[in-house]
Interface confidence: low
Amino acid sequence: PEPPTACREKQYLINSQCCSLCQPGQKLVSDCTEFTETECLPCGESEFLDTWNRETHCHQHKYCDPNLGLRVQQKGTSETDTICTCEEGWHCTSEACESCVLHRSCSPGFGVKQIATGVSDTICEPCPVGFFSNVSSAFEKCHPWTSCETKDLVVQQAGTNKTDVVCGPQDRLRA
């Protein structure tokens, strides 16, 4: 028969034949042959593989580093990675939760409505017309646009929720 060019789900093609992939939680020791099945071995302690695979090494479980404010939310198994979270009162800096900050920051265009406490996170609000925030901050409120008039200047560039107005000198060449 013709050697296969594609294999079924949970199989892989090697040496012109289809071998079974190793199930989650196991790694590949040796490929199948005409006479033997794929040989797989369970991942060791603190290791995992979360898909049907042909990996020769299992992945290490994520380390929740207490020096970064992290703790284990869910212990890893041979089929799943460890899930880290932050200590109470702290918040992950990303979805992957690789480090923690005390307060979540408000992005440019948003200001802090309420600073975080030990039990509640920062509350942000969009800067309304006439106000701006050009920084990512856990403390700073929206700042009012500069009043050009009070400085005897005119608006040369309008402000946005992320930028202040740009003031400039009055045009003296009036008809």
Partner: nanobody
Framework: EVQLVESGGGVVQPGGSLRLSCAAS????????MGWFRQAPGKGLEWVAY????????DYADSVKGRFTISRDNAKNTLYLQMNSLRAEDTAVYYC?????????????RGQGTLVTVSS
């Protein structure tokens, strides 16, 4: 290796004062933004005060404004927290912490803490 050692905690009556110290080593203290945090029994960590590395700018939690003062002595690699007019709700373990910046505090590193108990 960053090392922070807090001291100065103790038992004090309401209305009394305490001065906490934090001895720092293992990093360039003068260029680090530093802060004090506290954890009351059964509660989460709460920010108390920050002092920036640049210009020594400070900021305080509303609950301690006007009563607590954060300061630093870069020559001695030491951070201080002067606590006046202490109240029962100030009872907590106080931690000294390094941070990336005053705007976006990072967990960074912290010491073992010093216990402050305000009780009559």
């Amino acid at each position: 290796e960053v090392q922070l050692v807090e001291s100065g905690g103790g038992v004090v009556q309401p209305g009394g004062s305490l001065r906490l110290s934090c001895a720092a080593s293992g990093f360039t203290f003068s260029s680090a933004t530093m802060g004090w945090f506290r954890q009351a029994p059964g509660k989460g960590l709460e920010w108390v005060a920050y002092i920036s590395s640049v210009g020594g700018g400070t900021d305080y939690a509303d609950s301690v404004k006007g009563r607590f003062t954060i300061s630093r002595d870069n020559a001695k690699n030491t951070l201080y927290l002067q606590m006046n007019s202490l109240r029962a709700e100030d009872t907590a373990v106080y931690y000294c912490v390094t941070m990336r910046s005053i705007r976006n505090p990072d967990f960074g590193s912290r010491g073992q803490g010093t216990l402050v108990t305000v009780s009559s």
